[in-house]
């Protein structure tokens, strides 16, 4: 019963976690622009990993996608190659665990290859997880050092009289959706493991083994004393499945109409 | 068509308060921000606030915090802008102005103006 | 806040001449998230509201003629009236559109010489 509720837990938590890494790769809002002190702005940046929008005061929101491949920096790429990674992880594994649930029965499926694909899902699901962090991270240290930088010249041509002022960026939502999205694929993952553990059958085959005495034949069954003396066998059917086929998901986002005042 | 028609000419007396109204028709109120310009005569224009008609969400200049107030009735598509404590130099032409939507911040309708006259 | 400096104060120009006003801003004006420049020119007759021309530094505004135009990028920005018409006598002004508090020019007297 425990491992059932392990397992679905698991299963759901990994749901979640891995629509949030959809939502969190599809947002806009992976860095917003920064506001100082000022809580409103005429004009409002925001970028997501496919395109950049402006909100103006007015409401009105203009996106612009990425079109190109070789023009973005090599880290975005890196972000982008991470959250898809973990995406299409994230997508088998609950492929693989819908068929893995105890609650579910497809044919004659033993709990041996039920076991197994609960341990390969919890897998895929820890990766993905993983993946979804390294990804959100990456693209987190990317906004700090260049939050810095553009904060060290903040100001061009402090010498005359025109000043550029620098658009700085801090963290958007996105980042925040991943992190937790991430967080929650891993637990799932780690509970899906755990499930397995308790899905496994524990076989004990105790072989009898005769000794031959001079007089006499006696059978003895060796029991409480096999782990010490080397007799029976005490086996765990364990195999571990390295799933794998990757599919490309198409990432769309839609602009969102945001009056800021 | 659009037309912004705001209240009529106003004479108040120093350290009195204001309140010029602007009523919107031809377009869908809510969906277009508003805002109040005024111009002292033979000056330039001087951006005041802004309000949000949908949300009633008010955004004001520095210089006239405290002093100005933004409302909107939305059952009579009117907006109504106050100032209190005036002084003779906020003797001007006040101006309702809406934002085009997709203008990049410009304003594409103006109310014909109501002139406030501080005197003593 | 963003100062916005137009030049000349005001301009004599026979008609069908052209007419240029020039506006300098303190601050760019010019958004890198959409490569776009936030500022608006405005044509204001004695007793008259203001009336918009030009928004994104230049785009015409449905219904004005084409013989208004505007240039410009970042800080310096161009209104040109190509050929002067009698109606065009007026006072001209910019607009800063990219951060509160929005302001605007001095302003450009326009007459004919």
């Known amino acids: 019963m425990a491992v059932t509720a392990c397992q679905g837990l698991g299963f759901v938590v990994s749901l979640i976690g891995i629509a949030g890494i959809i939502a969190a790769t599809c947002m806009d809002q992976w860095s917003t622009q920064d506001l100082y002190n000022n809580p409103v702005t005429a004009v409002f940046n925001y970028q997501g990993l496919w395109r950049s929008c402006v909100r103006e005061s007015s409401g009105f929101t203009e996106c612009r996608g990425y079109f190109t491949l070789l023009g973005l920096p090599a880290m975005l790429q890196a972000v982008r190659a991470l959250m898809i990674v973990g995406i299409v992880l994230g997508a088998i594994g609950l492929l693989v665990s819908i068929f893995a649930l105890k609650c579910i029965r497809i044919g004659s499926m033993e709990d041996s290859a039920k076991a197994n694909m609960t341990l390969t899902s919890g897998i895929m699901f820890i990766v993905s997880g993983l993946c979804a962090i390294a990804g959100v991270s990456v693209f987190a240290n990317m906004l700090v050092t260049n939050f810095w930088m553009s904060t060290a010249n903040m100001y061009t041509g402090m010498g005359g009289m025109v000043q550029t002022v620098q658009t700085r960026y801090t963290f958007g939502a996105a980042l925040f959706v991943g992190w937790v999205a991430g967080g929650l694929t891993l637990i799932g993952g780690v509970m899906m493991c755990i499930a397995c553990r308790g899905l496994a059958p524990e076989e004990t085959n105790y072989k009898a083994v005769s000794y031959h005495a001079s007089g006499h034949s006696v059978a003895y069954k060796p029991g409480g004393f096999k782990a010490s003396t080397g007799f029976g066998s005490n086996t765990k059917n364990k195999k571990i499945y390295d799933g794998g086929a990757r599919t490309e998901d198409e990432v769309q986002s839609y602009p969102s109409k945001h009056d800021y005042v | 068509q659009v037309q912004l028609v705001q209240s009529g000419a106003e004479v108040k007396k120093p350290g009195a308060s204001v309140k010029v109204s602007c009523k919107a028709s031809g377009y869908t109120f809510t969906d277009y921000l508003m805002l109040w310009v005024r111009q002292a005569h033979g000056q330039s224009l001087e951006w005041m606030g802004n309000?949000?008609?949908?949300?009633?969400?008010?955004y004001y200049a520095l210089k006239f915090q405290g002093r100005v107030t933004m409302t909107v009735d939305r059952s009579t598509s009117t907006v109504y802008m106050e100032l209190s404590s005036l002084r003779s130099e906020d003797t001007a032409v006040y101006y309702c102005a809406r934002d085009g939507y997709s203008l990049r911040n410009a304003m594409d309708y103006w109310g014909q103006g109501t002139l406030v006259t501080v005197s003593s | 806040d963003i100062v916005m400096t137009q030049s000349p104060d005001s301009l004599a120009v026979s008609l069908g001449e052209r007419a240029t006003i020039n506006c300098k801003s303190s601050q760019s004006l010019f958004n890198s998230g959409n490569q776009k420049n936030y500022l608006a020119w405005y044509q204001q007759k004695p007793g008259q509201p203001p009336k918009l021309l030009i928004y994104g530094a230049s785009t015409r505004e449905s219904g004005v003629p084409d013989r208004f135009s505007g240039s410009g990028s970042g800080t310096d920005f161009t209104l040109t009236i190509s050929s002067l018409q009698a109606e065009d006598v007026a006072v001209y002004y910019c607009?800063?559109?990219?951060?509160?508090?929005?302001?605007f020019g001095q302003g450009t007297k326009v007459e004919i010489k």
């Open positions: 607009q800063n559109a990219h951060s509160y508090p929005y302001t």
């Open positions: 309000i949000n008609p949908y949300y009633g969400r008010t």
